[in-house]
């Protein structure tokens, strides 16, 4: 399976919502034995590989944002702790899952990984990411709405795993 | 915070079975692997096998013949069972926590089980 | 299975040096490598994950790096608590594996 970024790059301005996507692409094995863990952090494109490096999200952990369920079953972080950090990760039954972030500010401006392991039990873990840029914008140049530029089909292919 | 803690007869007779299990407290028992990790004494550490919350269980295959750890969810708990121990199985045994595509992020403090007749 | 294997075996330092310590494994293991401390009567300690990312409240002084099959932890100036046993263990498949230990002692 391979993780689409439907958009490699949001452009918003302070104070608006945003919801960064991700796409589980290919088959997905539904058996007992295999799950899915999916989880967001904010990285750099340094370091050994693009997303590599994991870094909170407004001081919460991959963990804290992780979303847990089996194929393409739906699930969002019920955590209040990620609420009150005006923050939600979520999935749907079509192998989308997103992150909002909510009242966004300049410190929010960065690289964004969205991270699937597919857990095969007696095998191993297989990774697979995607990253997105967010760039938050003040003053007469932001625009009013969050914009989105659309992924080449080659990066919105990206794969890295093991 | 979460917390594990390990308890369990600190000795076995040798064939015998040895019974552990370790309880969550502060925190899901939910999307993680509970782990169990043994180190004789002076050596290092050994990966003896982890369940899913789901129930899926994965083991050492140097062990896998005697082992089996099983999960009760409404109690927080999960458990080991290593049966025909010898001398050889005298370790202290640990209980952690790992994260799927990380490491063992939380540990229990580890119980000295002695395999003697 | 993948073999981890750490050097030095025992690292004799003085408190304010700097600590390099080595893990090779049998084969690849990408950068899925984790480093643990322990201390004696204690449980090992997370201290690295995926080669190079500190663990949940882990000093800056402690650093990871390397992919493949060569890793290094390096403690840039040692601190009298860091005098300890420093295991790795990778990830990339399934039976997990620990090195054996580098034990960091007082010169």
């Known amino acids: 399976f391979k993780v689409a970024t439907p958009y490699s790059l949001y452009v918003c301005p302070e104070g608006q919502n945003v919801t960064l996507t991700c796409r589980l692409l290919g088959p997905v094995d539904k058996g007992h034995d295999v799950t899915f863990y999916k989880t967001w952090y904010r990285s750099s494109r340094g370091e050994v590989q693009t997303c590599s490096e994991r870094r909170p999200i407004r001081n919460l952990t991959f963990q804290d944002l992780h979303l847990h369920h089996g194929g393409h079953q739906a699930a969002n972080t019920s955590h209040d702790l990620a609420q009150r950090h005006g923050l939600e990760s979520a999935s749907d039954h079509h192998g989308n899952f997103s992150i909002t972030m909510r009242n966004l500010t300049l410190l929010d401006s960065g690289l964004y990984c969205c991270l699937v392991v597919e857990i095969r039990h007696h095998h191993s873990e297989h990774r697979v990411h995607g990253a997105m840029e967010l760039q938050v914008q003040t003053g007469k140049d932001a625009p009013s709405n969050c914009v989105v530029y659309p992924s080449s089909s080659q990066d919105s292919e990206n794969i890295t795993a093991a | 915070q979460v917390q594990l803690q390990e308890s369990g007869p600190g000795l076995v007779k040798p064939s015998e079975t040895l019974s552990l299990t370790c309880t969550v407290s502060g925190g899901s028992i939910s999307s993680y692997y509970w782990s169990w990790i043994r180190q004789p004494p002076g050596k290092g550490l050994e990966w003896i096998g982890y369940i899913y919350y789901s129930g899926s269980t994965n083991y050492n295959p140097s062990l896998k013949s005697r082992v089996t750890i099983s999960v009760d969810t409404s109690k927080s708990q999960f458990s080991l069972k290593l049966s025909s121990v010898t001398a050889a199985d005298t370790a202290v045994y640990y209980c952690a926590r790992d994260i799927p595509a990380s490491a063992f992020d939380i540990w229990g403090q580890g119980t000295m089980v002695i395999v003697s007749s | 299975e993948i073999v981890l294997t750490q050097s030095p075996a025992t690292l004799s330092l003085s408190p304010g040096e700097r600590a390099t310590l080595s893990c090779r494994a049998s084969?690849?293991?990408?950068?899925?490598l984790a480093w643990y401390q322990q201390k004696p009567g204690q449980a090992p300690r997370l201290l690295i994950y995926d080669a190079f990312n500190r663990a949940t409240g882990i000093p800056a002084r402690f650093s990871g790096s390397g992919s493949g099959t060569d890793f290094t932890l390096t403690i840039s100036s040692l601190e009298p608590e860091d005098f300890a046993v420093y295991y790795c263990?990778?990830?990339?498949?399934?039976?997990?594996?620990f090195g054996g230990g580098t034990k960091v002692e007082i010169k």
């Open positions: 263990q990778q990830r990339i498949n399934w039976p997990l594996t």
């Open positions: 084969q690849s293991v990408s950068y899925y």
